[in-house]
Interface confidence: medium
């Protein structure tokens, strides 16, 4: 056989898809792979070739497509499971040829289960809404393509457990569920259930997400700089160690790239030739708004190092502050019986 | 007027398991603004918080008492419980249950039980 | 975990006086600070919210400031009935953490 352009497992698909659940599965090759969509490359000549391997097998076998009540069936360039069973888990391929032309690609579809409270191992969509910021929805995804626009499916959402009925904020509007105005206790889980007939038989689709209630772009204010601070004043005397914390709140802002860095005499730490260290932690509010500390620390700082300018920097998309440190050499104690005698005028 | 009242036994041995209940009337548990949370207080010191429970069964607990503390919800009942393990004398306090309200956007303990003393002795 | 700490500890004051009670975090909380009045044998009671929201039935005379990391509870004219222990609460971030109090007594 000719060679064939084989483009591997693409783990970026990840598919994982509930058992006992119709399953539509595009083949990755004209989404990502190449450059020409199915239609093209059927008025082409070229076939496309469905083919899988089993979990823990290495032989690739074909699809069964003659099961009952046609279970496995392709349509175009849409691998179709009517439902899924646990045993359909494993790597499949799609191969695009005639006599001349090759290419295929590997995807790995893992069949999971579910509790009756849609516990599982599937990975969860995470949808980020602002706190008390008006109106806000989420849709019901990945349910296109399933059942036409003639068929009118019955739409069932839960947070949890619990069916979405009666809830304070939350009002369930067919594919969308609508916060009228959202707060933290929101955050969680919600499923939407979608129910619908084909061939006389009644599907379900199960989609689950996780709401994130996260700080409104309404309260977004520029990065503040907590520490250093004009109250704290860092006197060290030559051979101790100088510790200086920046300390950033970041208001939670989409997409932001939130920066702390520090400066030494208005260079990075790495280009001065002292031995600094920079330790970084983050923690997160309840919305997702950001503390960063950075602590600049010199082990053995030397009387030049405390004359130097320390200014801690931060950024987000909200703008860019900076705060010096108020760094001293602490003045010795007197020794009494020299310096203080002598300034007593004893000889 | 929506009222806590906690309830269970005064007096636990060293070593084993603390459990409160929470009973809510005068409003319904399963409020989608509403966390329960349990906060303790030693007798002469300042307050602690040990976990909050939402309706739905989702928990949030102290670190400091995590391995140990457990809170459950009963939406029939209208009751919120916390089981303690492995009590020793420092867990002796005033137990309270509250009701946390998040209506406004910023969470607070709006409502509480009149809290339950619990002694660790033997 | 963010502490807080308040000061005073300890505050003598007359009838009439107005008092100021300082919570300090650890870290920035924006305003998701509360306030509780707490007296002996008694469950807390909800002050103030939102670092200055005043809680449905709590007194004009109570009134919270502050953003950030600096929170101030202020009584504006001391009454008979406000002598009790005062705490701050964030709701920030978890653990939910609580000041170590401060006790308003009689001069």
């Known amino acids: 056989s000719e060679r064939c352009d084989d483009w591997g497992l693409d783990t970026m698909r990840q598919i994982q898809v509930f058992e006992d659940e119709p399953a539509r599965i595009k083949c990755p090759l004209f989404e990502h792979f190449l450059k020409f969509n199915y239609s093209t490359a059927h008025s082409a000549g070229l076939t496309l070739i469905w083919y899988w391997t089993r979990q823990d097998r290495d032989l690739e076998e074909p699809i069964n497509f003659r099961l009952p009540e046609n279970r496995i069936s392709k349509e175009k360039d849409v691998l179709w499971f009517r439902p899924t069973l646990l045993n359909d888990t494993g790597n499949y391929t799609c191969m695009l040829r005639n006599t001349t032309y090759c290419s295929k690609v590997a995807f790995p579809l893992e069949v999971v289960q579910k509790d009756s409270c849609f516990n599982s191992p599937m990975k969860l969509p995470v949808h980020k809404l602002y706190i008390e910021y008006g109106i806000q929805r989420i849709t019901c995804p990945n349910v296109d393509g399933y059942f036409p626009s003639s068929v009118k499916p019955t739409i069932t959402w839960y947070m949890g457990c619990y069916k979405i009925q009666n809830f304070n904020n939350v009002i369930p509007e067919g594919m969308n569920l609508s916060f009228l105005i959202a707060f933290i206790s929101n955050n969680g889980n919600y499923t939407c259930v979608v129910t619908y007939p084909e061939n006389g038989r009644t599907f379900h689709l199960t989609r689950t997400l996780t709401v994130k209630v996260v700080g409104s772009p309404k309260n977004a204010v520029p990065p503040v700089i907590h520490s250093p601070n004009d109250h704290v004043v860092y006197e060290k005397e030559p051979g101790e160690e100088l510790l200086i914390p920046c300390t950033v709140y970041f208001s939670f802002l989409m997409d932001s790239r939130n920066e702390v860095w520090w400066t030494i005499d208005g260079k990075k730490p790495d280009d001065i030739p002292i031995d600094v260290t920079i330790n970084e932690s983050i923690s997160h509010s309840r919305t997702e708004d950001e503390t960063r500390t950075q602590i600049l620390s010199i082990k053995k700082v030397t009387s030049e190092d405390l004359k130097r300018s320390y200014v801690c920097h931060a950024r987000s998309a909200k703008g860019e502050v900076a705060k010096a440190a108020t760094v001293k050499q602490k003045v010795p104690a007197p020794r009494y019986t020299v310096e203080l005698a002598c300034g007593f005028g004893a000889t | 007027q929506l009222q806590l009242q906690e309830s269970g036994p005064g007096l636990v041995k060293p070593s084993e398991t603390l459990s409160l209940t929470c009973t809510v009337s005068?409003?319904?548990?399963?409020?989608?603004?509403?966390?329960w949370g349990w906060i303790r207080q030693p007798p002469g010191k300042g307050l602690e918080w040990i976990g909050s429970?939402?309706?739905?069964?989702?928990?949030d607990y102290n670190p400091s008492l995590k391995s140990r503390v457990s809170i459950s919800v009963d939406t029939s009942k209208n009751q919120f419980s916390l089981k303690l393990s492995s009590v020793t004398a420092a867990d002796t306090a005033v137990y309270y249950c509250?009701?946390?309200?998040?209506?406004?956007?910023?969470?607070?303990?709006?409502?509480w039980g009149q809290g339950n003393l619990v002694t660790v002795s033997s | 975990d963010i502490q807080l700490t308040q000061s005073p500890s300890f505050l003598s004051a007359s009838v009439g006086d107005r008092v100021t009670i300082t919570c300090r975090a650890s870290?920035?909380?924006?305003?998701?600070l509360a306030w509780y009045q707490q007296k002996p044998g008694k469950a807390p009671k909800l002050l103030i919210y939102a670092a200055s929201t005043l809680q449905s039935g709590v007194p004009s005379r109570f009134s919270g400031s502050g953003s950030g990391t600096e929170f101030t509870l202020t009584i504006s004219s001391l009454q008979p009935e406000d002598f009790a222990t005062y705490y701050c609460?964030?709701?920030?971030?978890?653990?939910?953490?609580f000041g170590g109090g401060t006790k308003v007594e009689i001069k």
């Open positions: 429970i939402y309706f739905t069964g989702s928990t």
């Open positions: 509250a009701k946390e309200d998040d209506s406004s956007g910023y969470y607070s303990f709006d409502y």
């Open positions: 609460q964030q709701v920030n971030s978890y653990p939910l953490t």
């Open positions: 005068g409003g319904s548990i399963s409020s989608s603004t509403y966390y």
């Open positions: 870290q920035g909380i924006s305003s998701y």
